[in-house]
Interface confidence: low
Amino acid sequence: YDFTNCDFEKIKAAYLSTISKDLITYMSGTKSTEFNNTVSCSNRPHCLTEIQSLTFNPTAGCASLAKEMFAMKTKAALAIWCPGYSETQINATQAMKKARKSKVTTNKCLEQVSQLQGLWRRFNRPLLKQQGSSDYKDDDDKHHHHHH
């Protein structure tokens, strides 16, 4: 799915209001420095691509994130604010239902959610531009970070 046409500010608002807190709840009891961030993203569409992959694609050692509260809210936000996203996810969701067994919070899952936190933070923190202007612009030069 191409996330270029999503309403980034609406997704950001959803993250700030609820998803961020759900991620913290999931990670409670884990030190913030316990895992090194190895996954990064360069702009908002790229960040959403990586976020979707880590949230919904089962990985070795962690097949159980899709039904977590933060995952469901992420899915809802993408479905609402990314045109055509829902249709692309129907088959993937069916496959995930089959793959899902019991809810187990493994160390690998904690590491994966730690990576997710980093990706969301990057999504919400537009990079400063090289020109040195006094305006804080996103990578795609369309959104100012202080608009909520």
């Epitope: 961020s20 807190k21 420095t33 990057r122 990079l127 400063l128 531009k129 090289q130 970070h145 202080h146």
Partner: antibody, heavy 121, light 105 residues
Framework: EVQLVQSGAEVKKPGASVKVSCKAS????????MNWVRQAPGQRLEWMGI????????SYNQKFKGRVTLTVDKSASTAYMELSSLRSEDTAVYYC??????????????WGQGTTVTVSS | EIVLTQSPATLSLSPGERATLSCRAS?????MHWYQQKPGQAPRPWIY???NLASGVPARFSGSGSGTSYTLTISRLEPEDFAVYYC????????FGGGTKVEIK
């Protein structure tokens, strides 16, 4: 534990330049912005500029534009602030301050210990 | 540039009293941060995003406000609360207020 350790005090002559370093540890250096803030004796805090270690992008307080240069060395997790054409009124304590994204805003959550720069002939 | 004006510049109060510090912005801002600074020390984050207390800050502190008017309140002053408090905004670049010194009367 997040730590920002700054270089030692400097004494400079008017017209010279000074370069202050800020070594970061305890977090992923490229994940957060780094601000530079100064405080002249008995005065308010004055924001000088900000840099994104991720891509080297900068933004400066117009007051210092042309005189201040912010840079980073990602491999050393160190930020630098260079101020040129020094004058006596640049005598101040210079702080680096990490800026983290809290739920609802960018805040300077960790500060260096400060570097005293004295400009005197 | 958004200018932040803090008042009063100095607040002389006794322990146990209530302190109200004001910060006014020249234009509307999204949120306000507050920092505490003691002599010879770097500033410490005190209140994030208008009303969220930083880690370790006692519950007697509170923050409120919106638009151009923000307030830091200390319900009952303790000896360790006497310091200078700065407000800071980030909606347009970053600027600090002139500070309010809370001193013992």
């Amino acid at each position: 534990e997040v730590q920002l350790v700054q270089s030692g005090a400097e004494v400079k002559k008017p017209g010279a330049s000074v370069k202050v370093s800020c070594k970061a540890s305890g977090y992923t250096f490229t994940d957060d912005y780094m601000n530079w803030v100064r405080q002249a004796p008995g005065q308010r805090l004055e924001w000088m500029g900000i840099i994104s270690p991720y891509n080297g992008g900068t933004s400066y307080n117009q007051k210092f534009k042309g005189r201040v240069t912010l840079t980073v060395d990602k491999s050393a997790s160190t930020a630098y602030m260079e101020l040129s054409s020094l004058r006596s009124e640049d005598t101040a304590v210079y702080y680096c301050a990490r800026e983290d994204y809290d739920y609802d805003g960018y805040a300077m959550d960790y500060w260096g210990q400060g570097t005293t720069v004295t400009v005197s002939s | 540039e958004i200018v932040l004006t803090q008042s009063p510049a100095t607040l002389s109060l006794s322990p146990g009293e209530r302190a109200t510090l004001s910060c006014r912005a020249s234009s509307s801002v999204s949120y306000m941060h507050w920092y505490q600074q003691k002599p010879g020390q770097a500033p410490r984050p005190w209140i994030y995003a208008t009303s969220n207390l930083a880690s370790g800050v006692p519950a007697r502190f509170s923050g409120s406000g919106s638009g151009t008017s923000y307030t830091l309140t200390i319900s009952r002053l303790e000896p360790e609360d006497f310091a200078v408090y700065y407000c800071q905004q980030w909606s347009s670049d970053r600027t600090f207020g002139g500070g309010t010194k809370v001193e013992i009367k």
